[in-house]
């Protein structure tokens, strides 16, 4: 089976369709598949050189 | 440990063939997109195709479509691509890809995060 | 198809400078962007993805930026083992396209 029309973009198709809890609407491919959280890690102290970059936990199996 | 591994790869005549394999350890291809991207020699990244097991969805670069075809078999946990009508111009080493995803206010927000080692396929009389 | 313009197409740089690479989309793709990294007969790894998210075991001086369709990635103090070559892609929607790659070489 073949995905939607190309010509469809993301932003003009409808809205994501609702996904269980571990998953996540995925654009690309426009389907629900399985997500891992994203997380900001605490703010550096007072004259850090640079925010800490903002990173990921692995997606549930 | 997540792995990829492909296999298949080798040469072959201009209009000949071949099926490409992505066995994948560590985790479950139907719970994510499985990409074919390849590199001819000296070249960059080319996308080439993807699925998405759990439902079959397909999308194809248009430089292979109708020539490439690409499934995944959950119950053995890999992907294929098979290769009719190839071309000199195919000549490149393919790789398979996992796609990752984060959520991000319900979307995806990710990239391959792994990639098997690669294999080469040679079109060449 | 949406198009992914990196450049430059190759740089010359030494350890410990600050290189930037940029890539434009001929569309709008939001922060749908990742950017890897491939040495010579080496799979691509994954740096950055959702334009400015840092992937898992990805040293700090890597950074991405940008959103719409100018992104650029960033390594703050050039290590040894960086010198290779970096591709970004797109996933905003299929067909995901990557950028032609810029080689990041010795000075």
């Known amino acids: 089976m073949r995905r939607g029309p190309r010509s469809l973009r993301g932003r003009d198709a409808p809205a994501p369709t609702p996904c269980v809890p571990a998953e996540c609407f995925d654009l690309l491919v426009r389907h629900c598949v399985a997500c891992g959280l994203l997380r900001t890690p605490r703010p550096k102290p007072a004259g850090a050189s640079s925010p800490a970059p903002r990173t990921a936990l692995q997606p549930q199996e | 440990e997540v792995q990829l591994v492909e296999s298949g790869g080798g040469l072959v005549q201009p209009g000949g063939s071949l099926r490409l394999s992505c066995a994948a350890s560590g985790f479950t291809i139907s719970s994510s997109s499985i990409h074919w991207v390849r590199q001819a020699p000296g070249k960059g990244l080319e996308w080439v195709a993807w699925v998405l097991p759990s439902v079959g969805f397909t999308d194809y670069a248009d430089s292979v479509k109708g020539r490439f075809t690409i499934s995944a078999d959950t119950s053995k946990n890999t992907a294929y691509l098979q290769m009719n009508s190839l071309r000199a111009e195919d000549t490149a080493v393919y790789y398979c890809?996992?796609?990752?995803?984060?959520?991000?206010?319900?979307?995806?927000?990710?990239?391959?995060?792994?990639w098997g080692q690669g294999t080469l396929v040679t079109v060449s009389s | 198809d949406i198009q992914m313009t990196q450049s430059p197409s190759s740089l010359s740089a030494s350890v410990g400078d600050r290189v930037t690479i940029t890539c434009r989309a001929s569309?709008?793709?939001?922060?749908?962007v990742a950017w890897y990294q491939q040495k010579p007969g080496k799979a691509p790894k994954l740096l950055i993805f959702?334009?400015?998210f840092l992937y898992s075991g990805v040293p700090s001086r890597f950074s991405g930026s940008g959103s719409g369709t100018d992104f650029t990635l960033t390594i703050s103090s050039l290590q040894p083992e960086d010198f290779a070559t970096y591709y970004c892609q797109q996933s905003e929607v299929s067909p995901p396209t990557f950028g032609q790659g810029t080689k990041v070489e010795i000075k």
């Open positions: 959702a334009a400015s």
């Open positions: 569309e709008e793709i939001a922060t749908a």
């Open positions: 890809a996992r796609r990752v995803c984060y959520n991000r206010l319900g979307v995806c927000a990710g990239g391959m995060d792994y």
